[in-house]
């Protein structure tokens, strides 16, 4: 930022690293909760047509896949990895890909992933081959 730009106090719209650099915000698919046909596949596209500028630069992309007796839904949002989402920590927030991991939720099958490359929650990956620290 040019030197004349005032530094804001207690404002998380502007995230800086130790050198005072400003972080560009993430671009994520952001359709909230939608019905999905994604089932029994190694990977799926979100079919979300909305790409949003995440409000806060520390936010990452998140996808949540849920299946119960009635339907399947896919949720796509931006979220701050310092805060839990659906009561779970976003432990994979630094990943460039959205690798789905199953979480224990009573009465449903629940998978969640987070990632930090642009629109990375558009392609959600269930395949086990990615779940062993695959850098790609």
């Amino acid at each position: 930022i040019p030197p004349h730009v005032q530094k804001s106090v207690n404002n998380d719209m502007m995230v800086t690293d130790n050198n005072g650099a400003v972080k560009f915000p993430q671009l994520c698919k952001f359709c909230d909760v939608r019905f999905s046909t994604c089932d029994n596949q190694k990977s799926c596209l979100s079919n979300c047509s909305i790409t949003s500028i995440c409000e806060k630069p520390q936010e990452v992309c998140v996808a949540v896949w849920r299946k119960n007796d009635e339907n399947i839904t896919l949720e796509t949002v931006c979220h701050d990895p310092k805060l839990p989402y659906h009561d779970f920590i976003l432990e994979d927030a630094a990943s460039p890909k959205c690798i789905m991991k199953e979480k224990k939720k009573p009465g449903e099958t629940f998978f969640m992933c987070s990632c930090s490359s642009d629109e990375c929650n558009d392609n959600i990956i269930f395949s086990e081959e990615y779940n062993t620290s695959n850098p790609d």
């Epitope: 930022i1 690293d17 650099a21 400003v22 972080k23 560009f24 671009l27 500028i53």
Partner: nanobody, 124 residues
């Protein structure tokens, strides 16, 4: 060294329109995603809109969707922001910024990545 220079700011009444421009010197304009960023008095940065270099795909913050339109003319090395239905809360200094592929941070004071800003005041 590429420099970014904004223009088009000014005083406008609520409901009015303004068109901001950002002229980039240098020949690498087409390699960068371009952003409009604003900072209201005493507030932090708000990332308003972005546009891709190829295909010109656009992105908007929720606060300006349907009112602002970003565009670029790569032949003129110029970025634009058409602002309609302006509100008092749009009052801010507006900056253009450029982002290289896979770039996550930009250092303070990099005038080749940030313009000096143009003030937009929405008031009756």
């Amino acid at each position: 060294e590429v420099q970014l220079l904004e223009s088009g700011g000014g005083l406008v009444q609520p409901g009015g329109s303004l068109r901001l421009s950002c002229a980039a010197s240098g020949s690498t304009f087409t390699e960068y995603r371009m952003w409009w960023v604003r900072q209201a008095p005493g507030k932090g940065l708000e990332w308003v809109s972005a546009i891709e270099p190829i295909g010109h795909r656009t992105y908007y913050a929720d606060s300006v969707k349907g009112r602002f339109t970003i565009s670029r003319d790569n032949s003129k090395n110029t970025l634009y922001l058409q602002m309609n239905s302006l509100r008092a809360e749009d009052t801010a200094v507006y900056y253009c910024a450029k982002q290289a592929p896979n770039q996550r941070y930009v250092a303070r004071g990099r005038l080749d990545y940030w313009g000096q800003g143009t003030l937009v005041t929405v008031s009756s």
